[in-house]
């Protein structure tokens, strides 16, 4: 039978080394055996490159393409092939479709005056455009109470957040995770970092009375 694309490729770039395209076929497909995504930078002399897609689900394919350190002018021509049959053709400008890398190494440390210090690492090296463009969202949730959660927007430069222990329930176990966004690139949010968990042992002041 004929091979058809149900949802055409949607692509995002981490704006440093990788672009990822995902699409959905109209029926379960062995992506790596049946399909190829070719990509070529619209730049004089550039070569045509081929990406072998992998299955994310039965009919969903994903392709990770190594790219050079992206610049705003870069535009790629993309062609999705099933053998000799061209299924889809389009263009992709990484600077217009940025999905930042996931922040790393989220840790929680007790700090002075009953505060918790949450720290994580900026996923970009200092020389990359995005290093100084990231803002973060930190989600803090009570492991035993789904209603007890807080969201903090970190819009200053440093990848840190100070959290008053008193804003959390005493004796409860909390988990935090962080994601990043690049405002000037109108990016999507990054994936959430892995969660880190800690016990909030703050003792409310009333108990001292």
């Amino acid at each position: 039978g004929s091979v058809k694309v149900l949802h055409e490729p949607s692509c995002f770039s981490d704006y440093i080394s990788t672009s990822v395209c995902q699409w959905k076929m109209d029926h379960p497909t062995n992506c790596s055996a049946e399909l190829r995504l070719s990509y070529q930078l619209d730049f004089m002399g550039s070569e045509n490159h081929t990406c072998v897609p992998e299955n994310r689900e039965d009919s969903v394919c994903v392709c990770s393409m190594p790219i050079d350190d992206a610049v705003e002018a870069d535009v790629y021509q993309l062609d999705l092939w099933a053998g000799q049959q061209l299924l889809w053709s389009g263009s992709f400008q990484p600077s217009k479709h940025v999905k930042p890398r996931t922040p790393g190494n989220l840790t929680v440390h007790p700090n002075i005056s009953h505060t918790w210090l949450l720290m994580w690492t900026n996923p970009y090296p200092t020389e990359n455009h995005l290093h100084s463009e990231l803002t973060y969202m930190v989600n803090v949730s009570n492991d035993n109470d789904p209603e007890d959660f807080k969201v903090y927007n970190v819009t200053y430069m440093g990848p840190t957040l100070r959290l008053a222990a008193s804003t959390l329930k005493s004796g409860a176990s909390y988990s935090a995770r962080v994601r990043a966004w690049a405002q000037t690139y109108n990016s999507t949010w990054s994936d959430w970092s892995p969660s880190t968990t800690w016990l909030n042992y703050y003792e409310p002041w009333e108990q001292h009375l």
């Epitope: 730049f43 004089m44 002399g45 550039s46 790219i67 050079d68 705003e72 002018a73």
Partner: antibody, heavy 125, light 112 residues
Framework: EVQLVESGGDLVKPGGSLRLSCVAS????????MTWVRQAPGKGLQWVSL????????YYADAVKGRFTISRDNAKNTLYLQMNSLRAEDTAVYYC??????????????????WGQGTLVTVSS | DIVMTQTPLSLSVSPGETASISCRSS???????????LDWYLQKPGQSPQGLIY???KRASGVPDRFSGSGSGTDFTLRISRVEANDTGVYYC?????????FGQGTKLEIK
């Protein structure tokens, strides 16, 4: 040492054909785009054509489009320029030159960093 | 197509002086910050051209530091300081950004 040696230049009548060759050595030929540039007697330099490292993409000056064909044989480290329907205004010294490194996603540019000695093509009746 | 305009078309300089050649393009040759696709070439009498400067300011291998390139966007300059008799020849700028590649008309440098 990088070397480019052109050959194939000759006296040919208008409407005739000629094939120029450029044999390369001293660098990884397949990794680089190659370019042909010509120079009419007493005139300036004129870009003619470019081919990327794999041979999969070619570019031409408007003056030669449809008449000239650039190609390469990476196994023989050789660049070619097939010239058909030649005209008097095609009379020139033809140089081959090493252009950008194309094995990277975005070609790395060093200008035309090495040139051959040139071969003379004369189109006259 | 991008048009390249070189000035002056001829230049006479005494040894030890500085020579400056200008090249202007009809469109920006900046692909990204720091990447201006403008080259300078020298063709000495009876020889093949040789590369001097690429990407606007980078010296080709073996080129003395007396040769320097500057500029961005559409305006570029080649400066030759402490000019020597050996620098005589025709200097060309060329845009390497997009097809068709194009050379300037050339500047003939004569040493007095």
């Amino acid at each position: 040492e990088v070397q480019l040696v052109e050959s194939g230049g000759d006296l040919v009548k208008p409407g005739g054909s000629l094939r120029l060759s450029c044999v390369a050595s001293g660098f990884t030929f397949r990794d680089y785009a190659m370019t042909w540039v010509r120079q009419a007697p007493g005139k300036g330099l004129q870009w003619v054509s470019l081919i990327n490292g794999s041979g999969g993409k070619t570019y031409y000056a408007d003056a030669v489009k449809g008449r000239f064909t650039i190609s390469r044989d990476n196994a023989k480290n050789t660049l070619y320029l097939q010239m058909n329907s030649l005209r008097a205004e095609d009379t020139a010294v033809y140089y081959c030159a090493v252009d950008r490194l194309t094995k990277t996603i975005r070609p790395q540019y060093y200008g035309l960093w090495h040139w051959g000695q040139g071969t003379l093509v004369t189109v006259s009746s | 197509d991008i048009v390249m305009t070189q000035t002056p078309l001829s230049l006479s300089v005494s040894p030890g002086e500085t020579a400056s050649i200008s090249c202007r393009s009809s469109q920006s040759l900046t692909y990204s910050i720091g990447y201006n696709y403008l080259d300078w070439y020298l063709q000495k009498p009876g020889q093949s051209p040789q590369g001097l400067i690429y990407l606007g300011h980078k010296r080709a291998s073996g080129v003395p530091d007396r040769f320097s390139g500057s500029g961005s966007g559409t305006d570029f300059t080649l400066r030759i300081s402490r000019v020597e008799a050996n620098d005589t020849g025709v200097y060309y700028c060329m845009q390497g950004l997009q097809s068709p590649l194009l050379f300037g008309q050339g500047t003939k440098l004569e040493i007095k």
